[in-house]
Interface confidence: medium
Amino acid sequence: QAACPESWIGFQRKCFYFSDDTKNWTSSQRFCDSQDADLAQVESFQELNFLLRYKGPSDHWIGLSREQGQPWKWINGTEWTRQFPILGAGECAYLNDKGASSARHYTERKWICSKSDIHV
């Protein structure tokens, strides 16, 4: 199981950070990077449900983005495998109270960082 910093939440060998603050998508990723993490990569339906449960009602950026006409990709460059629907026509994904949606990168939202637990 995950051994995470105190402000983070452990779930299935990963650590997640939920922000209070709001930033645009790029600044959110910059923050996560400063914490040796990335905007959250969601790798299973269980993980998605965990994040939806913990984040509360606010929208939170996650680590999915796309170039115009290109497929969704995670921060690490791997393609999104359509584990869940992403609504909207934006280029950056976020979690809302129902699931995932998308918006323009410059809009401000809370965010979720994730990192693998290296202490396991």
Epitope: E6, S7, G10, S19, D20, H119
Partner: antibody, heavy 117, light 112 residues
């Protein structure tokens, strides 16, 4: 259903020792930091100590440093507080609590420790 | 250590009316990670405390929406929009930004 249950409290003489236990169920114990908090009628609620998921990080309030030791056994879903060199001012109800995002989100019912001669 | 100061220490309230409790910290509770780790707890006589609000304004699961938290820096407020009989007891603020974690002495809410 998440439950935390403390045990091990009782009457002990000044200078004596006690070991408190907290057994949990209903969540993955090894995923959470855990905390001991005590409550006295005079001083109210006082944070005592906390411990990281894997036990590698521990913090204590100054008044118990060197006397109390927090530990955990993830295989047994148990949290412990070894209390040595007990003093009258350690008399309190001791609660274990689960940490989540630096809040104390679930609490046990508490166990009473009385230090008196 | 961070000192957490409640006002008022006691608050007689009328059922169905709003109530407000304040908590002030002796220094800022904003963490370097951008979050503010200020929680509110409620304790009824003979029971352990229970979490109402964490990170200033996030309601814990199962907490009625008549409870809300606000504030920043050093000044924080818990509001009850319509007091119900079950809301009596002592309300505590607690900070978890700095070590040691510290609690306020509490505000006792009782029905007029």
């Amino acid at each position: 259903q998440i439950t935390l249950k403390e045990s091990g409290g009782g009457l002990v003489q000044p200078g004596g020792s006690l070991r408190l236990s907290c057994t949990v169920s209903g969540f993955t114990f090894s995923n959470n930091w855990m905390t001991w908090v005590r409550q006295t009628p005079g001083k109210g609620l006082e944070w005592v100590a906390n411990i990281k998921q894997d036990g590698t990080e521990k913090h204590y309030v100054d008044s118990v440093k060197g006397r109390f030791t927090i530990s955990r056994d993830n295989a047994e879903n148990s949290l412990y507080l070894q209390m040595n060199s007990l003093r009258g001012e350690d008399t309190a109800v001791y609660y274990c609590a689960r940490n989540s995002q630096r809040s104390f989100d679930y609490w046990g019912q508490g166990t009473l420790v009385t230090v008196s001669s | 250590d961070i000192v957490m100061t409640h006002t008022p220490l006691s608050s007689p309230v009328t059922l169905g009316q709003p109530a407000s409790i304040s908590c002030r910290s002796s220094q800022s509770l904003e963490h370097t990670d951008g979050n503010t780790y200020l929680s509110w707890l409620h304790q009824r006589p003979g029971q352990p405390p229970r979490l109402l609000i964490y990170k200033v304004s996030t309601r814990f699961s199962g907490v009625p929406d008549r409870f809300s938290g606000s504030g920043a820096g050093t000044d924080f407020t818990l509001k009850i929009s319509r007091v119900e009989a079950e809301d009596v007891g002592v309300y505590y603020c607690v900070q978890a930004t700095h070590y040691p974690r510290t609690f306020g002495h509490g505000t006792k809410v009782e029905i007029k």
